[in-house]
């Protein structure tokens, strides 16, 4: 049977095409450096096909290797602001289950106001990804400036 | 029938593997902040498999979720240049049809001379992507410094 | 036969899902600007499925279009350090066979301490990718700060 037909017959999730793109909802309360995300067509161009949100954090539903990407832009920022409030750092990691806790991706803003990166990493069903923004500067909630996503690549 | 065989029998486009990587052709005339792109094997390592170029702008041929990525390097630049000519900003968006016009990705150069980012976004057949570079600085046309591409990820 | 079944029956490599994510092993001796990489589950979250390492450089095993991505963070670095030692430049290219030698991706650190980018590029079986870091600053070997990977996208 042809792949093109298989596409029509099978739910996409069974093909392993898990993917999500999230927009910033809000930052955490004091002492909580996490960014809280939201996604779904009602919100614009964000979506979750497979992964789910758990209290604003992204939970993986399928084992595999994923491409994880993120961009965060600071809201009121110039190169002077960024260096004065330095170090402002963004880290993406597995925050639960605790046994799998690890930092996957880390960047500092230095004299810039935007960081953007991506990497391939193995993730397992149940892994929850957290994005920690240290420092006092607020991230922009503009959907073209701050976003976070994952794409399943292979088993 | 096996997927490996299906690959041989079906044209790749029918598998939904639309992909393009473009190199900078030229900047726009006065009052036109758009970058104009070109692609094809005769030009080096750029290519279009599915999407097409329409007057230097990238037009999508297949509905789906795409990974959009871009890197732009300014042709002569230092941390002083970038801050002196600030704000120099790069925005990638859907510019037509007008009803779907939206900014997808935005970065400022601040004290840097290169921006690079990527994101997942839903695109529809007929969407044209434009890349707007504000400010007066010239982008480099070196193919390893400035490029723009899309990759179909899933329906 | 369904794609989901085909996944179980065929080795993944025959589906063209070549992918690798590497971590920094060490820098080269004097006059050798190359970064030397390592990968494998014993080392943490790095892996090679298809491509191989040849003396710390990544060798491609399957023709196709690949997404190449990299992040490099300088080890002892502030915006002042970066600008004083500036410009430190990172280039990713095909270094062998010599007949296919070309720079694919190039970025300067300017006043930042991390560069990150990605691009789509055609690669052929036997192509070896090298990552050259010019300048005197040392890259961080933290696996969440410095990494390099490729993902096969389509034939």
């Amino acid at each position: 049977q042809r792949f093109a037909q298989a596409q029509q017959q099978l739910p996409l999730e069974s093909l392993g095409w898990d993917v999500a793109e999230l927009q910033l909802n809000h930052t955490g309360p004091q002492q909580d450096p996490r960014l809280y995300w939201q996604g779904g067509p009602a919100l614009g161009r964000s979506f979750l096909h497979g992964p789910e949100l758990d209290k604003g954090q992204l939970r993986i539903h399928r084992d595999g290797i994923y491409m994880v990407h993120i961009q965060v832009t600071l809201a009121i920022c110039s190169s002077t602001t960024a260096s004065r409030h330095h170090p402002t750092t963004l880290a993406v990691g597995i925050c639960s289950p605790a046994s799998r806790s690890i930092s996957l991706l880390r960047l500092s803003f230095h004299q810039g106001c935007t960081i953007a990166s991506q990497r391939l990493t193995p993730l397992a069903r149940g892994d929850t990804l957290c994005t920690n923004l240290t420092g006092t500067l607020l991230p922009s909630r503009n959907t073209d400036e701050t976003f976070f996503g994952v794409q399943w690549v292979r088993p | 029938q096996r997927f490996a065989q299906a690959q041989q029998q079906l044209p790749l486009e029918s598998l939904g593997w639309d992909v393009a990587e473009l190199q900078l052709n030229h900047t726009g005339p006065q009052q036109d902040p758009r970058l104009y792109w070109q692609g094809g094997p005769a030009l080096g390592r750029s290519f279009l498999h599915g999407p097409e170029l329409d007057k230097g702008q990238l037009r999508i041929h297949r509905d789906g979720i795409y990974m959009v990525h871009i890197q732009v390097t300014l042709a002569i630049c230092s941390s002083t240049t970038a801050s002196r000519h600030h704000p120099t900003t790069l925005a990638v968006g859907i510019c037509s049809p007008a009803s779907r016009s939206i900014s997808l990705l935005r970065l400022s150069f601040h004290q840097g001379c290169t921006i690079a980012s990527q994101r997942l976004t839903p695109l529809a057949r007929g969407d044209t992507l434009c890349t707007n570079l504000t400010g007066t600085l010239l982008p480099s046309r070196n193919t390893d410094e400035t490029f723009f591409g899309v990759q179909w990820v899933r329906p | 036969q369904r794609f989901a079944q085909a996944q179980q029956q065929l080795p993944l490599e025959s589906l063209g899902w070549d992918v690798a994510e590497l971590q920094l092993n060490h820098t080269g001796p004097q006059q050798d600007p190359r970064l030397y990489w390592q990968g494998g589950p014993a080392l943490g979250r790095s892996f090679l499925h298809g491509p191989e390492l040849d003396k710390g450089q990544l060798r491609i095993h399957r023709d196709g279009i690949y997404m190449v991505h990299i992040q490099v963070t300088l080890a002892i670095c502030s915006s002042t350090t970066a600008s004083r030692h500036h410009p430190t430049t990172l280039a990713v290219g095909i270094c062998s066979p010599a007949s296919r030698s070309i720079s694919l991706l190039r970025l300067s650190f300017h006043q930042g301490c991390t560069i990150a980018s990605q691009r789509l590029t055609p690669l052929a079986r036997g192509d070896t990718l090298c990552t050259n870091l010019t300048g005197t600053l040392l890259p961080s070997r933290n696996t969440d700060e410095t990494f390099f990977g490729v993902q096969w996208v389509r034939p």
Epitope: - | H26, T27, G28, P29, Q30, Q31, D32, P33, A75, I76, C77, S78, T80, T81, R84, T136, L137, L138, P139, S140, R141, N142 | H85, H86, P87, T89, S108, T134
Partner: antibody, heavy 120, light 107 residues
Amino acid sequence: EVQLLESGGGLVQPGGSLRLSCAASGFTFSSYAMSWVRQVPGKGLEWVSVISGSGGRTDYADSVKGRFTISRDNSKNTLYLQMNSLRAEDTAVYYCARHDYSNRFYFDYWGQGTLVTVSS
Amino acid sequence: DIQMTQSPSSLSASVGDRVSITCRASQSISSYLNWYQQKPGKAPKLLIYAASSLQSGVPSRFSGSGSGTDFTLTISSLQPEDFATYYCQQSYSAPPTFGGGTKVEIK
């Protein structure tokens, strides 16, 4: 063969204006960024201004900003430099120069130059 | 602005000599360094770009080296037509700036 030919130089009083032209041939003019570079007779070279191939992007040396305007007419394959509020220190041979295709700031072809003298 | 300093400002040499001219930038410019030759009453001519790349049509006796702040233009065997003034130029940071020139004269 790539050729660049400047014209429009001459003697002008301080505060006066002059318009230089550079006629280009032998290449696709609209595909290349162009610059003006000047040289005080017997002295070194100084970059003055740049314009992108399509004419949409320009930049100037601080010494001429606000007084000089670079422009181009791609239909006539001609580059211009409008010089206003001229000063004695603007006296120089003015060259038009073509940028390498990459837009990077090195100049692979130059014209023969036109002399501008600002004096009362 | 980045200052470019050339040395020597002039030198005398004979046909067949190996000649080296140095250029120093006031800050690191990576390999964004170009060399030009100018003869009296003529326009400059690009010889070397990106520190060491030979411009098309330029004889192979001309070579460039260096990175960071220190650069060298070498003429391996001076020919009669090489007597001219040579300028370095940085294309790293705006505005692009030139060295003061080195005049190569016949001994």
